[in-house]
């Protein structure tokens, strides 16, 4: 089929970076400025992506490949191919409908993006809190309270059953 196609379809000979120009007797014409074709045999060239506003150019468009964008400082990429730019917040905050807001008590965010997550509930693993959590950092769990009491055996007691809706400590 491919051999038949190439014999019958002169467009299949047009390489990437060109298009098969129906207006010029199916001659392979170079892609016009600000357009590209990444595969051979194309009947049109695609318009290059433009990186505008908070989007900045990471890779220029060429006749054979599209431009690639990333985000200006203070923003980070979301979505495939950096289809969106989202404003950074500070650590200890999350982006809400009303802007960057501090994490509620009992939650933390150690990045400039994403949402505040609940502190680890140490007691669910039968452990105690070694270092308290903050808006920016999760709690650090230590040995179980039994391990810390004098004369306690080295056998860790089984973790208590998880209670539904147990609040983070």
């Amino acid at each position: 089929f491919e051999r038949t196609r190439s014999l019958q379809d002169p467009c299949s000979n047009c390489p990437a970076g060109t298009f098969c120009d129906n207006n010029r007797n199916q001659i392979c014409s170079p892609c016009p400025p600000n357009s590209f074709s990444s595969a051979g045999g194309q009947r049109t060239c695609d318009i290059c992506r433009q990186c505008k506003g908070v989007f900045r150019t990471r890779k220029e468009c060429s006749s054979t490949s599209n431009a690639e964008c990333d985000c200006t400082p203070g923003f980070h990429c979301l979505g495939a191919g950096c289809s969106m730019c989202e404003q950074d917040c500070k650590q200890g905050q999350e982006l809400t409908k009303k802007g960057c807001k501090d994490c509620c008590f009992g939650t933390f965010n150690d990045q400039k993006r994403g949402i505040c997550r609940p502190w680890t509930n140490c007691s669910l693993d039968g452990k105690s809190v070694l270092v308290n959590g903050t808006k920016e950092r999760d709690v650090v769990c230590g040995p179980s309270p039994a391990d810390l009491s004098p004369g306690a055996s080295s056998v860790t007691p089984p973790a208590p059953a998880r209670e539904p809706g147990h609040s983070p400590q």
């Epitope: 506003g53 989007f55 964008c69 923003f75 979301l78 950096c82 289809s83 404003q87 982006l95």
Partner: nanobody
């Protein structure tokens, strides 16, 4: 072709006011959410304010109670009324479509104006 043209920038003293306008064409303005962003000298972009097609408004914390975004669908124009201006408001202000409807988020399909300079100085 989509066009966004900002105007109204200039030099103003601290405590003064300016009203920026953004004239839109080439798309259905009345059903589009719009936004304002700014870029201070040597700094990154900052999301300033947004307005939904229905009129709901959103502001970044630093301009709340000082800036007011509004729109006139009959004139295809969005405005940013800036009161009690401070030196830290000095920036190039950009008008942009706001297809994501999410605070602080723009998409690749959004369109941007060329910007208008606002300088707050005594």
């Amino acid at each position: 072709e989509v066009q966004l043209v900002e105007s109204g920038g200039g030099l103003v003293q601290p405590g003064g006011s300016l009203r920026l306008s953004c004239a839109a064409s080439g798309f259905t303005f009345s059903s589009s959410a719009m936004s304002w962003a700014r870029q201070a000298p040597g700094k990154g972009f900052e999301w300033v304010s947004g307005i939904y097609s229905g009129g709901s408004t959103y502001y970044t914390e630093s301009v709340k109670d000082r800036f007011t975004i509004s729109r006139d669908n009959s004139k295809n124009t969005v405005y940013l009324q800036m009161n009690s201006l401070k030196p830290e408001d000095t920036a190039v202000y950009y008008c942009a479509t706001w297809g994501t409807l999410r605070f602080g988020v723009w998409a690749e399909y959004d369109h941007w104006g060329q910007g208008t300079q606002v300088t707050v100085s005594s």
